[in-house]
């Protein structure tokens, strides 16, 4: 085969008991993994890395640590209070030679607004990133540095899916060899030019993202240059040809009827597990209508749930999902009317998603009450609105200027929301806490790794 066909990075995704606790069921956790992988797959597939195209991702294996594994001594992620560097290290202490990358998803509130951490790839002489094999390091431990971690929690709030997807793409971007974006060309969101600024920053921006600006889910030219060099050198080491579905990864892919994982994971009476012979694995057992692995509208008794059963909770912007009686998938929910308030009155619904700012309800657009504009620091975590394309009219929702719409009531950003022009995140006390993009790196310098590794870890 030609190297051009080796374009798929196979992933091992683990989730800890806190991630499971938040999402509640194995099926919901698998749906989260699937949506994250699909999101980065779309981003990377549509990026031309200096002639290297169609880079894709496939889940090779998953491990879901449930709340039952919280006390299991073989579960390295069982500890309740671990910092982000230690959490990444626990992942790296496992052997991940069978995978391009190995990630752990968690629901932990790490210090200083950190949403993820990963080892940075380099074209040569590197320890870390894609395809890196397990080896002995100076602290006397074997480690796999083809690793990263992400969390879905920030300052006590859960980040929106689009932000979490970009976090995953960002951390994987480090693994692929990209450092943080810097310089005017690659950080347009910091520009004084309004036309450039409004498109926002790229995936590898060092600080905060809202996920809804044009550039937020694209790689900058700086990232593309770095990633293409690493892909050129490294992808032949572990990337595979895309194609066949992977039976046993818990995700029902094209060509599979169901997928309940391997025999040690499969709790499903409906589906043949991945350890079965070729003709049977990932197929429905005889006489079974469906498998819960196909979706939430299938019972544990392998039958479609009845028409009236709920399969998705009502949310701010969408009505509850109701099974239709003839598929295991949960049908799309009806959207609530556009401009319905959501996310505690800080945003509005657009086409069933909590996507717009509350400002849009009144023909305004959201702006940052940024200290560089001479605004009071106390306003950095207020929702602020301005007239379209007119930053000179940026004012807090609590200001007299917008009192006709908000009646003088200050609407504050949710904890974990970007603030001060994406330099930081709001904490629970409504203070804008600047993101120290290289904090964990600095702490690791004092930890167990030898000096040659210092440059190769990043948020």
């Amino acid at each position: 085969t030609t190297s051009a066909e080796k374009n798929t990075c196979q992933l091992y995704i683990q989730t800890d008991h806190l991630f499971f606790k938040y999402y509640g069921t194995r099926e919901a956790v698998i749906a989260q993994i699937s949506s994250h992988v699909k999101a980065i797959d779309t981003i990377y597939q549509t990026t031309d890395f200096s002639g290297i195209r169609n880079i894709s991702f496939m889940v090779k294996r998953i491990r879901i640590n449930t709340t039952a594994d919280e006390k299991d001594p073989t579960n390295p992620f069982r500890f309740p209070n671990i910092g982000v560097e230690k959490f990444l290290e626990l992942n790296s202490e496992q052997n991940h030679d069978d995978y391009c990358l190995a990630y752990v998803f968690t629901d932990r509130d790490f210090d200083d607004g950190v949403l993820g951490l990963a080892w940075v790839g380099a074209p040569s002489g590197s320890s870390g990133g894609i395809c890196e094999k397990s080896k002995l390091y100076s602290d006397g431990k074997k480690k796999s540095l083809n690793t990263g971690i992400i969390t879905v929690q920030n300052y006590g709030s859960h980040v929106p899916p689009k932000v979490s997807h970009i976090t995953f793409a960002h951390e994987v971007g480090h693994n692929f060899g990209s450092p943080h974006d810097s310089g005017t060309e690659c950080t347009p969101g910091e520009s004084k030019n309004l036309g450039q600024k409004e498109n926002g920053n790229y995936i590898m921006y060092a600080r905060a993202t809202s996920g809804d600006k044009l550039n937020n889910n694209k790689f900058s030219l700086c990232s593309i240059r770095n990633i293409s060099q690493v892909l050129e050198k490294k992808r032949n080491n572990c990337f595979v040809e895309s194609g066949q579905p992977i039976c046993g990864n818990g995700m029902v892919e094209q060509g599979e009827e169901c997928d309940c994982g391997y025999s040690d994971q499969c709790k499903d009476e409906c589906c043949f597990d991945a350890n079965q012979p070729e003709g049977r694995k990932c197929k429905l057992k005889p006489g079974k209508q469906c498998s819960p692995s196909q979706g939430p509208c299938c019972t544990a008794q392998c039958a479609f749930k009845s028409k009236s059963e709920k399969c998705r909770d009502d949310s701010d912007c969408a009505r509850e999902g109701i099974c239709n009686g003839f598929t295991a998938l949960c049908p799309a929910s009806d959207p609530k009317p556009n401009f319905t308030d959501c996310n505690r009155h800080t945003q509005v619904c657009i086409n069933g998603q909590c996507a717009g700012s509350i400002c849009e309800k009144y023909g305004l657009e959201e702006c940052t009450c940024a200290s560089s504009d001479g605004k009071d620091d106390k306003e950095l975590c207020h929702v602020c609105c301005m007239k379209k394309m007119d930053p000179s009219t940026c004012a807090s929702t609590g200001s007299v200027q917008w009192s006709r719409h908000f009646s003088g009531r200050t609407i504050t950003l949710q904890p974990g929301s970007p603030c001060n022009d994406f330099r930081g995140y709001c904490d629970v006390f409504m203070r804008c806490r600047l993101v120290d993009a290289d904090g964990p790196l600095a702490r690791l310098k004092k930890a167990i790794f030898s000096p040659e590794l210092y440059e190769n870890i990043a948020e």
């Epitope: 007239k387 007119d390 004012a395």
Partner: nanobody, 123 residues
Framework: EVQLVESGGGLVQAGGSLRLSCAAS????????IGWFRQAPGKEREGVSC????????YYADSVKGRFTISSDNAKNTVYLQMNSLKPEDTAVYYC????????????????WGQGTQVTVSS
Amino acid sequence: EVQLVESGGGLVQAGGSLRLSCAASGFTFDDYAIGWFRQAPGKEREGVSCISVSDGSTYYADSVKGRFTISSDNAKNTVYLQMNSLKPEDTAVYYCAADRLAYGLDPNFYDHWGQGTQVTVSS
């Protein structure tokens, strides 16, 4: 097309009164806030008072509170500024401005402006 025409300015002795009018046309009067602003020679334009036409809520600069009163006649699409106990420091060109979204005394927030009327207070 939005049009604002001020009238009622003139020369008055300190302690006297004037009533300024702002006649509006070309827009749905009820949807807007109307503000009065003034600019003295060599100084920045400053907000004096404003009114939200739909609900009648008003706002005043500290320097004119208790002396100036803003009101509107929705049938005539006109906003008035009654100025009592005038002082020499009230001397300026007085402008009215209108905006569909904003309110308050920051001139940056107002999209539509009249030509202004001169008020001179002699001591």
